[in-house]
């Protein structure tokens, strides 16, 4: 199956790479604008220059294009704990990230929130914290993993998953009590 091409892609595919078809005259191929610039006026004829203008402050284009407007720079989402890694330039969007010892949790394709990496208290680090993944902890004996934290088996209720992990501990406690001498 051949994927369906949009009108713009169809028009572009007629011209060699780095050029696009003139919107009013499909016999003319105009040179695309460099990154950091946008299309102000199409080329007047074959072999003539396309009128490209530099993006204004607060906007960018990251690749060669024939856009009529530059794209607005992204803003880092402070309410998501994001910080600016590098600011927007005419040819590159703002890069947002998280602080040291934090990882990104993606709520959707383009939206992430920063969370603190787990420290694995009462356990050991099985896998270190990554840019997009929290630390993976392994808990010490007598502790079980709940919401990526090692919690004491004394907090394990019968209805919870932890009963399997804490069973030996619970049995030991019972055994000690039962075998008590008077």
């Amino acid at each position: 199956l051949v994927p369906h091409l949009g009108d713009r892609e169809k028009r572009d595919s007629v011209c060699p790479q780095g050029k696009y078809i003139h919107p009013q005259n499909n016999s003319i191929c105009c040179t695309k604008c460099h990154k950091g610039t946008y299309l102000y006026n199409d080329c007047p004829g074959p072999g003539q220059d396309t009128d490209c203008r530099e993006c204004e402050s607060g906007s960018f284009t990251a690749s060669e294009n024939h856009l009529r407007h530059c794209l607005s720079c992204s803003k880092c989402r402070k309410e998501m704990g994001q910080v600016e890694i590098s600011s927007c330039t005419v040819d590159r969007d703002t890069v947002c990230g998280c602080r040291k010892n934090q990882y990104r949790h993606y709520w959707s394709e383009n939206l992430f929130q920063c969370f603190n990496c787990s420290l694995c208290l009462n356990g050991t680090v099985h896998l270190s914290c990554q840019e997009k993944q929290n630390t993976v902890c392994t808990c010490h004996a007598g502790f079980f993993l709940r919401e990526n934290e090692c919690v004491s088996c004394s907090n394990c209720k019968k209805s919870l998953e932890c009963t399997k992990l804490c069973l030996p501990q619970i049995e030991n406690v019972k055994g000690t009590e039962d075998s008590g001498t008077t």
Epitope: E109, L111, F115, E147, N148
Partner: nanobody, 116 residues
Framework: EVQLLESGGGLVQPGGSLRLSCAAS????????MAWVRQAPGKGLEWVSF????????YYADSVKGRFTISRDNSKNTLYLQMNSLRAEDTAVYYC?????????WGQGTLVTVSS
């Protein structure tokens, strides 16, 4: 067929509490992050809170932080929003929504009115 049914709204005095529920069906609930979104009279939609698949990750809008708590019970296919210290500005229709990528499914909403 995907269905999201909100309940628990009503009239409450400032400073009061309400607990909203959203019963989900027609999809594997535990496979999706869920959200509460609200729309105040004559205003646009506002994110209230998100919750991740297992409930570990949560997000709250600054306007509700410290007052609202989102939770989920995957065994009951239900999303909750505990709302405490309610204010007049919390008056809105509250919707639960599935899949934060495209919000293709919404409930019909439940009205919360905070008034003395």
């Amino acid at each position: 067929e995907v269905q999201l049914l909100e309940s628990g709204g009503g009239l409450v005095q400032p400073g009061g509490s309400l607990r909203l529920s959203c019963a989900a069906s027609g999809f594997t609930f535990e496979d999706y992050p869920m959200a509460w979104v609200r729309q105040a009279p004559g205003k646009g939609l506002e994110w209230v809170s998100f919750i991740g698949l297992k409930g570990i990750h949560t997000y709250y809008a600054d306007s509700v932080k410290g007052r609202f708590t989102i939770s989920r019970d995957n065994s009951k296919n239900t999303l909750y929003l505990q709302m405490n210290s309610l204010r007049a500005e919390d008056t809105a229709v509250y919707y639960c929504a599935k899949d934060l990528n495209n919000f293709d499914y919404w409930g019909q909403g439940t009205l919360v009115t905070v008034s003395s």
